[in-house]
């Protein structure tokens, strides 16, 4: 806390300008009017105030707006935003995407801070859903943003927003998250033709069920191995050797290098060795010829 002291003669600030960087903390407290600061917030970011000076300016705004800052002030906080606590931010009502962008810009190039996470949470909750423009903005600043959401939070993403998602935005998503996103992507891209559809849906296929993979295998998509390795194991296991061959096209040769890794390893164990041999890749570990395969899961489902 800065002590209340009278402003020295001739030092009363008539505007927020660069001369204020030479003010001591107590002089800023005594000589800068909070209402003036609020109306000229856009100037603060243009002036190289120190950490300690920003503390004083924040203190003045806190006194002026104990219930939380108005959006007209929030939009122009600039580097003063970095001084806010999550508790401060929870008092705000941020509705404008421009305000969100302005504050995200302040922290650009740095990890998502607790302040930023709170700001985003407040903004998205205020909007009711994660619309396309918001998602566009958030993933531009934080490519991993989507994968930081829980499956429950992702369920509020409308299919139309999926158009804003880039492949790199899904890099850190786990299968539970892709399970939620895949049906939305399927719906969003449903009117595209085969090859265009595959380009768009490819990043989401970690959430695809077996029947959709079977359908893709009929469309000459030539899925790369990196995508195949991210598929759900339970979705890959029922695929036949012929279906996997069609799904991967010329990339099928890559199975050999991945034969010890899931889902390829588990898939191999489910195939007849005879069928695997038709690929000519030397894949080993399939069911020997003459063995009968009992699908116990099917038997349990029937009983």
């Amino acid at each position: 806390e800065v002590e209340k002291t009278a402003c020295p003669s001739g030092k009363k600030a008539r505007e927020i300008d660069e001369s204020l960087i030479f003010y001591k903390k107590w002089e800023l407290e005594a000589c800068v009017d909070a209402a003036l600061l609020a109306t000229q917030m856009d100037r603060v970011n243009a002036i190289p105030f120190t950490y300690e000076q920003l503390d004083v300016l924040k203190h003045k705004l806190d006194e002026l707006y104990p219930q939380g800052y108005p959006e007209s002030v929030i939009q122009h906080l600039g580097y003063l935003f970095l001084k806010m606590s999550p508790e401060d931010i929870r008092k705000w009502n941020v509705t404008s995407l421009e305000t969100l962008k302005a504050l995200l810009e302040v922290n650009k190039g740095h990890e998502m801070s607790p302040q930023v996470a709170t700001l985003i949470d407040r903004f998205v909750k205020g909007r009711g859903q994660l619309d396309k423009d918001t998602l566009d903005t958030l993933t531009a600043f934080y490519p991993g943003y989507l994968c930081s959401l829980s499956p429950e939070e992702l369920s509020s993403v409308p299919p139309s927003s999926i158009w804003a998602v880039r492949p790199q935005d899904l890099d850190t998503c786990d299968p539970r998250q892709l399970d939620v996103l895949y049906p939305k992507a399927r719906l969003a891209f449903q009117n595209m033709n085969g090859s265009e559809y595959f380009v768009k849906i490819q990043s989401f296929l970690g959430g695809a069920p077996t029947e959709d993979l079977k359908a893709l295998s009929q469309q000459n998509v030539s899925m790369d191995l990196a995508t195949f390795m991210k598929l759900r194991t339970d979705a890959v296991l029922p695929l036949t050797v012929a279906e996997v061959q069609k799904l991967l096209g010329p990339h099928v040769e890559g199975l050999k290098a991945e034969e010890r890794h899931r889902p390829v390893r588990d898939w191999i164990l489910r195939q007849r060795q005879d069928d695997l041999d038709t690929l000519g890749l030397g894949l080993q570990g399939g069911i020997p010829n003459g063995y009968l395969v009992l699908d116990l899961s099917m038997q349990e489902a029937l009983s």
Partner: nanobody
Framework: VQLVESGGGLVQPGGSLRLSCAAS????????VAWYRQAPGEQREPVAA???????IYADSVKGRFTISRDNAKNTVYLQMNSLKPEDTAVYYC??????????WGQGTSVTVS
């Protein structure tokens, strides 16, 4: 963010030095920046500043002798110091933008006028 100040040294009264401050990223090309100094046993004080719009301001003690400038392409800020006096002896630091708001500082560069 990394801030690297350089160019300090030992100089005679009346001499000149040019300090440089390089920053990682595009920090100085978009932000307001300032040079500070800290003499032994004293608090750090601002000596020169440049707003994001490019206007400059100087502490009374260095007015007419020091000049702050920047090269956006090199993401570097300079402080040209002429007519140096013994009382200019200090460690000089530059800062601005994100790192300043977060209270991150470089190592500084030492200037001795003797």
């Amino acid at each position: 963010v990394q801030l690297v100040e350089s160019g300090g040294g030992l100089v005679q009264p009346g001499g000149s030095l040019r300090l440089s401050c390089a920053a990682s990223g595009s920090m100085f090309s978009i932000n307001a920046v300032a040079w500070y100094r800290q003499a032994p046993g004293e608090q750090r004080e601002p000596v020169a500043a440049m707003t994001s719009g490019g206007s400059t301001i100087y502490a009374d003690s260095v007015k007419g002798r020091f000049t702050i400038s920047r090269d956006n392409a090199k993401n570097t800020v300079y402080l040209q110091m002429n007519s140096l006096k013994p009382e200019d002896t200090a460690v000089y630091y530059c800062n601005g933008g994100w790192s300043q708001a977060m209270d991150y500082w470089g190592q500084g560069t030492s200037v001795t006028v003797s």
